[in-house]
């Protein structure tokens, strides 16, 4: 969690003189409590915005905007501390705006918006505004909260920030799956623009089930600059293992700028549709099946062949 | 000291109704998440649910997905699992639990034994 | 919802072995994973976060690696007092999932 790194942070605005300042997420009142305070804030609403860094960096915002009730508690409203908590990390940050100047009522409403917290794709946000001074330990609860969950990077506007492209969002690589006879998936992918190696990772399951019955993995080595964004086409050998028919192909690349945590793409291929009549059953059932050779399912030593050409 | 204290476990049959508690103390309750873990006999742990700082983000695991109910009392230090139309699968040692800034789970109660039997 | 997996199940090393354990998720999930070592009849304690990070208080032959899918928790000297069950966790976003365990002792 960070704030945008430009531009001086303002909350003045006319009839309020304002600034804005770094917080603990502790404000002097919770330890020092006052006995008048102000009311909550109303109508917090948070919304996805999207702002440039002085170096020209696009980055996913938070914007945060409330109003203030129409009461004579804002007499007492000293200003504000909006605080941020990422979910999955406890991380928190804060900002105090600091009132300069006593607010008065006046015709409109008072609105105030702040849209500097920089947020991750994918990730979950309780975005809270406390007004200050913070309420008395028995006092009502002078602060709202809302949650806030930023799309990832599938998402067609955060695809071009600068976190999503780092990642490799840019790339589409169009992936196409097809069963071919004995055993085998022709898979074809569209490479990207970066001479930098991929790894196709099969993984098998048997129809209604999601423990894997076959697991592959198949290195592609870089492609030359006069095969980017050409289609790269690998022929993959599956398990012959009965019922082991659907099958998950993910496509890893290794961009520079993601390394081994690039955005990955997959397809799926269905297993077969079961046929509608029963299959006709014997008249004698043997009483056992005669045994198998091999009862292991995972592909420890690269048991599944392959071969892969670039395709102009 | 930073403890986690849980209780209202014991012994309940199936489709009946258990309240846990976890009290807290030496820390800043309201400054963080909490979650329930919960790990059945001779099994591994899984996750049960989280509840934000302010109550506006909760989830939960699919196994309890409307039958556990999280909610929290920042004033009292308490977190609780309300749990519903309880299962035999439900049976287990419950923790409350607290992350750690940066992520995972650094401090965690002793945990208090759920068993659902008829 | 993203699965866990772990690997081996259980193992059995002798005192002053280099230890390996490895966990893969069925997607990316950046850094966003924890170790746990549980000792038997008791709680959880949080070993190694943000894949590589070390807990404070934990002895530094715990070492975690690994970024994306595929993740290592490493003890570079096995210790008596390892023996437990070790349990990855991913936290990029709900479900918290943990891993099935890794049960370690001694030979």
């Known amino acids: 969690l960070r704030l945008l790194d430009h531009r001086a942070l303002v909350c003045s605005q006319p009839g309020l003189n304002c600034t804005v300042k770094n917080s603990t997420c502790l404000d002097d009142s919770w330890i020092h409590p006052r006995n008048l305070t102000p009311s909550s804030p109303k109508d917090l609403q948070i919304q996805l915005h999207f702002a440039h860094t002085q170096q020209g960096d696009l980055f996913p915002v938070a914007h945060i905007e409330w109003t203030l009730q129409t009461d004579a508690s804002i007499l007492y409203l000293e200003g504000a501390e909006l605080s941020v908590l990422q979910l999955n990390t406890n991380e928190r940050l804060c900002v105090k705006f600091q009132f300069l100047s006593m607010l008065q009522h006046h015709r409109k409403r008072w609105r105030f918006s702040f849209s500097h917290f920089v947020v991750d794709p994918g990730q979950e946000y309780e975005v809270t505004v406390h007004h200050l001074p913070k309420p008395i330990p028995d006092g009502d609860p002078n602060h709202q909260s809302k949650n806030f969950l930023v799309p990832d990077c599938e998402h067609a506007r955060m695809k071009v920030t600068t976190p999503c492209m780092s990642s490799g969002s840019l790339w589409d690589p169009n992936i196409t799956v097809e069963t071919l006879e004995a055993h085998q998936l022709r898979v074809s992918f569209t490479l990207w623009n970066e001479s930098t190696h991929y790894q196709i990772l099969l993984t098998s399951f048997p129809h209604m089930e999601n423990h894997s019955c076959f697991e592959h993995m198949h290195h592609i080595p870089a492609p030359r600059p006069e095969e980017f964004h050409q289609r790269s086409n690998v022929t993959l050998t599956l398990r012959n293992l009965k019922g082991c028919c659907r099958h998950q192909v993910q496509i890893q690349p290794f961009f520079s700028s993601c390394l081994n945590d690039c955005l990955r793409h997959s397809a799926t291929v269905s297993c077969p549709e079961m046929p509608d009549t029963p299959e006709p059953i014997p008249d004698y059932m043997p009483l056992w099946e005669p045994r198998s050779g091999s009862s292991d399912y995972k592909d420890d030593d690269d048991k599944g062949s392959s071969h892969h050409h670039h395709h102009h | 000291e930073v403890q986690l204290v849980e209780s209202g476990g014991g012994s309940v049959q199936p489709g009946g109704s258990l309240r846990l508690s976890c009290a807290a103390s030496g820390f800043t309750f309201s400054s963080y998440s909490m979650n329930w873990v919960r790990q059945a006999p001779g099994k591994g742990l899984e996750w049960v649910s989280i509840i934000s700082s302010r109550s506006s983000i909760i989830h939960y695991a699919d196994s309890v997905k409307g039958r556990f109910t999280i909610s929290r009392d920042n004033a009292k230090n308490s977190l609780y699992l309300q749990m519903n139309s309880l299962r035999d699968e439900d049976t287990a040692v419950y923790y409350c639990?607290?992350?750690?800034?940066?992520?995972?789970?650094?401090?965690w109660g002793q945990g208090t034994t759920v068993t659902v039997s008829s | 919802d993203i699965q866990m997996t772990q690997s081996p199940s259980s193992l059995s090393a002798s005192v002053g072995d280099r230890v390996t354990i490895t966990c893969r998720a069925s997607?990316?999930?950046?850094?966003?994973l924890a170790w746990y070592q549980q000792k038997p009849g008791k709680f959880p304690e949080l070993l190694i976060y943000?894949?590589?990070t070390l807990q404070s208080g934990v002895p530094s032959r715990f070492s975690g690696s690994g970024s994306g899918t595929d993740f290592t928790l490493t003890i570079s000297s096995l210790q008596p007092e390892d023996v437990a069950t070790y349990y990855c966790q991913k936290y990029n976003r709900a479900p918290f999932t943990f891993g099935p365990g890794t049960k370690v002792d001694i030979k």
């Open positions: 943000a894949a590589s």
């Open positions: 639990a607290r992350p750690k800034v940066g992520g995972g789970m650094d401090v």
């Open positions: 997607q990316g999930i950046s850094n966003y």
